[in-house]
Interface confidence: low
């Protein structure tokens, strides 16, 4: 827990009047169908709302959509459907919002059956105006913006053509046919897979991976026998069919596909899959599915080149390809990830790592909770978190875990306390130290969101009945106030606040139902008068992240450095403000064996920090394949963890010698694959 806090609940004065003056209702002139909401830009206050309603007629379905715009964080909305010529917008494509603060929006319209192409509406002024553009193709996917230049768009057509626009959708050019999947890389590069023999499905495993660095003027084939590809951090991954059988292997490139190395990961068969769980510029978490329909696999963490992998977690819960995993990056504290494992008895348990996958442990039991019926020992149990898997199983879990980079240390999640995840109705738990300790925050399932960089937490009870009450806390979930935001309860459908958790506005969405009709309604509440003053220096306290033993000189060291943060005191009721920047002071730690992962050919026995040689490789020369050349590895078993900044202390030696021998373990010359290298 963050130090120096007043545990007593102090009520916020006169909050009902303050909130009532800042509650804005908007009733939408719409029959209830579906509604989607998008924020346009950062700190602009601009929200677009698209409502769609399908009227089933005898022979066909007639669709109607309306577009609304707010420029004050949802307090007021204006119907701007006339700007898109009252056209029916296809909700499956959503609203394609441009990156950063480009102010760009693309809406894809429904067109009649016989048209030669689709239609889009484009805005580059935060949806003040739209231009209608008829496309020379029917889009299969939403328009994808280049992360580097929002004028560059790509889309796939229903005919599997890859189309590119260089002027924000004004003019389109088909740069390649027979394309299965296309993605933007860095430097406005496009990666895509192509098929030769008829279809993406038929050619799976025989696809080619292409790259264009000049928006389709020229191309380079960078891979063959491709099953699929993915981008993560600075890594490009391809899963490639082996020559001899139906297995696949992962190959990795850190230079946009010019050179490839075979990842030291198990190969997978037809029914298995690989999944990039998380990636940054330092490393990648890779899930490798187990053979058979087990519903689990193994998490591996990579070295800095994405080539050598260490086993991180066994029996990692991940249902079939494209299925559910609970893997969650806790963005409020560096190095922390939460996920679920499937134990031998088929119960599901939550595990947490604080060091980027180096070690996993159970979550500590919350102080204010009892062990439930799943616990064999009523005094010893853990907190288990509900995430995507629970939601997919239709458990009473309205939201996945929540953390925000600028609300340091805060994690909010539904959970149960026992030996495994329970199917009973969950409660909401909060951690204020990045997952080391937990407290029950709210009884029963709730929707929740973080405002003002953690200065306010807002929650609404998950109920099948209409609601009219919102709860809020100004002390990181210790004490709660309730506010009745409307006299007439509404059927609640969602909470919306501006991404980034810097806003002080929350929008409550729902619909009213009367005998004749139902209508969409939103209530936007501004909490600015609750936090009536700006925070000052005295409102913050110093907090050492990852601190477990204050007596230890190396306390707080994770990945080679420790960080002290300025945290808002729980007792301070003030505004961090929209310009709030997390203040942190890093300091480098001495290296210990914990700062190294086991090198190729080595592993760490359980509960041991030393790396020992794999028995099957003892006495063999360690040779592996890198960029198509055979390398000889002289090592005593350690390699520094990617992103680890430690200095001094222990310093295991390793040396890689280029054997100047071609080993083409990579798929650039698949006919010469050398099995020795793996």
């Amino acid at each position: 827990s963050a130090p120096g806090e007043d545990e007593e609940c102090g009520r916020v004065r006169d909050f009902v009047a303050k909130l009532a003056n800042n509650t804005h209702q908007h009733v939408f002139d719409d029959l209830r169908g579906s509604v989607s909401l998008s924020w346009v830009g950062d700190s602009t206050g601009v929200i677009l709302v698209l409502t769609t309603f399908h009227v089933p007629l005898v022979i066909m379905t007639f669709g109607q959509s309306k577009l609304y715009r707010s420029e004050d964080y949802g307090k007021n909305f204006k119907d701007i459907t006339d700007l898109i010529n009252n056209t029916f917008i296809r909700t499956e494509f959503g609203m394609a919002i441009g990156p950063e603060n480009s102010g760009k929006v693309v809406l894809t319209a429904e067109v009649s059956g016989g048209s030669r192409g689709g239609r889009i509406f484009r805005s580059s002024d935060f949806a003040k105006n739209f231009v209608q553009t008829d496309l020379p193709f029917h889009p299969l996917t939403q328009m994808m913006y280049s992360p580097q230049n929002s004028d560059y768009l790509l889309a796939l057509s229903t005919e599997n053509g890859l189309w590119v626009s260089k002027n924000f959708g004004g003019k389109w050019e088909e740069i390649h046919k027979a394309v299965c999947l296309a993605k933007w890389g860095s430097d406005n590069t496009i990666f895509f897979t192509t098929y030769a023999n008829g279809s993406c499905k038929a050619d799976l495993g025989a696809l080619e991976l292409w790259r264009t660095s000049d928006l389709g003027k020229s191309f380079k084939t960078i891979g063959v026998k491709i099953y699929s590809f993915g981008l993560g951090g600075r890594f490009l991954f391809a899963s490639v069919m082996a020559d001899k059988d139906t297995t696949r292997r992962i190959h990795v490139s850190t230079d946009q596909g010019d050179t490839w190395s075979m990842a030291q990961l198990p190969s997978v068969g037809q029914e298995q899959f690989y999944s990039i769980l998380a990636a940054n510029d330092d490393m990648v978490f890779m899930h490798v599915d187990e053979p058979g329909d087990t519903g689990f696999g193994t998490i591996f963490t990579s070295d800095d080149r994405g080539i050598v992998y260490s086993k991180s977690l066994d029996r990692h819960l991940y249902t079939t390809t494209g299925g559910e995993t609970d893997f969650t990056n806790v963005t409020s504290l560096r190095g922390v990830y939460i996920t679920s494992v499937l134990s031998e008895d088929n119960s599901i348990q939550t595990m947490i790592t604080f060091d980027q996958g180096g070690r996993w442990t159970h979550l500590r039991k919350p102080e204010n909770s009892e062990c439930d019926a799943t616990a064999k020992n009523k005094n010893e149990c853990s907190l288990h978190i509900h995430a995507s898997y629970s939601i997919s199983q239709k458990l009473n879990v309205p939201m996945a875990p929540l953390s925000e980079p600028n609300a340091v240390g805060i994690v909010i999640a539904h959970g149960s306390v026992g030996d495994a995840i329970s199917v009973m109705v969950p409660d909401v738990y909060i951690s204020d130290d990045g997952g080391y300790s937990w407290t029950k925050m709210l009884e029963g399932p709730h929707y929740y969101t973080i405002l003002d960089s953690g200065g306010i937490i807002v929650a609404i009870e998950h109920s099948s009945r209409p609601i009219n009450v919102i709860k809020f806390s100004t002390d990181e979930g210790q004490c709660w106030q309730t506010y009745t935001f409307t006299r007439d309860p509404i059927y609640f459908t969602g909470l919306a606040s501006e991404p980034g958790a810097r806003s002080m506005n929350i929008s409550i969405w729902g619909f009213t139902e009367s005998f004749l009709t139902s209508q969409w309604v939103s209530y936007t509440i501004d909490f600015k008068d609750i936090l009536e003053r700006n925070c000052e220096e005295k409102d913050y306290t110093i907090w050492l992240a990852h601190s477990t033993d204050p007596e230890d000189y190396e306390d707080g060291c994770i990945l080679g450095y420790k960080e002290q943060f300025l945290r808002l005191r729980k007792s301070s009721v003030c505004q961090n403000g929209r310009d709030y920047v997390v203040t942190k002071q890093p300091s480098i730690c001495l290296c210990s064996l914990e700062d190294f992962l086991c090198d190729f050919g080595y592993y760490r026995p359980e509960n041991d920090s030393k790396c020992v040689e794999q028995p099957e490789l003892k006495g063999h020369d360690l040779e592996f394949c890198l960029y198509g050349r055979e390398e000889h590895l002289t090592t005593n078993g350690y390699r520094k963890i990617p992103g680890d900044k430690c200095q001094g202390g222990v310093n295991p030696v390793r040396e890689v010698k280029d054997l100047k021998k071609k080993c083409t373990s990579n798929f650039l010359s698949p006919e010469k694959q050398n099995s020795k290298s793996n």
Epitope: R211, S213, F219
Partner: antibody, heavy 117, light 108 residues
Framework: EVQLVESGGGLVQPGGSLRLSCAAS????????MSWVRQAPGKGLEWVAT????????YYPDILKGRFTISRDNAKNSLYGQMNSLRAEDTAVYYC??????????WGQGTLVTVSS | DIQMTQSPSSLSASVGDRVTITCRVS??????LAWYQQKPGKAPKLLVY???NLADGVPSRFSGSGSGTDYTLTINSLQPEDFATYYC??????????FGQGTKLEIK
């Protein structure tokens, strides 16, 4: 019209250094990879270095690694080649070329580097 | 590294002739090959990329063919301005992206 103009060549003593420049115009410089290629008198073409469009990735043949550094300044539409520890066998015309991926589609007129004592 | 063997190293031909230059590669480069023309004292000029695609402004008498490890540049009906040195270059996989040693085409 695409134009690439090299400069910075000249006479240099063995062991010396030289910085080549290439000024690009007539195209969007920051979406293209760029390369240096050289040609010794009376000999064939030899690839020297390549840099990706954003300058993130650089490539060299093994024989030049450590002695040749390619860099670019996209704000100035310029490509550079820093040559160190020059030897007589580095004497050549050095060309800068636009390198979009599967070919080098536009070349400069070249700049002559002579390494001699 | 991938080896490029260009042949012949030189050949003589007359205006109007059909000429073929070949480039053999030490391993499959999946059509990632370009052809260039260079005249004395001038910079190389791209003729063909991706083995078969004619670069902008290149006359249709030039054509590229081949796949796998064997590639060919053909000039139909040789013109006076075609007498030059021709180079192939691969762009497959691992650098170095080597050039062939060149073929000098001379007037007979």
């Amino acid at each position: 019209e695409v134009q690439l103009v090299e400069s910075g060549g000249g006479l240099v003593q063995p062991g010396g250094s030289l910085r080549l420049s290439c000024a690009a115009s007539g195209f969007t410089f920051n979406i293209y990879g760029m390369s240096w290629v050289r040609q010794a008198p009376g000999k064939g073409l030899e690839w020297v270095a390549t840099i990706s469009s954003g300058g993130i990735y650089t490539y060299y043949p093994d024989i030049l690694k450590g002695r040749f550094t390619i860099s670019r300044d996209n704000a100035k539409n310029s490509l550079y080649g820093q040559m160190n520890s020059l030897r007589a066998e580095d004497t050549a015309v050095y060309y800068c070329a636009r390198h979009p991926g599967g070919a080098m589609d536009y070349w400069g007129q070249g700049t002559l580097v002579t390494v001699s004592s | 590294d991938i080896q490029m063997t260009q042949s012949p190293s030189s050949l003589s031909a007359s205006v109007g002739d059909r000429v073929t230059i070949t480039c053999r590669v030490s391993e499959n480069i999946y059509s990632n090959l370009a052809w260039y023309q260079q005249k004395p004292g001038k910079a190389p000029k791209l003729l063909v990329y991706a083995a078969t695609n004619l670069a902008d402004g290149v006359p249709s008498r030039f054509s590229g063919s081949g796949s796998g490890t064997d590639y060919t540049l053909t000039i139909n009906s040789l013109q006076p301005e075609d007498f030059a040195t021709y180079y192939c270059q691969h762009f497959w996989g691992t650098p170095p992206w080597t050039f062939g040693q060149g073929t000098k085409l001379e007037i007979k």
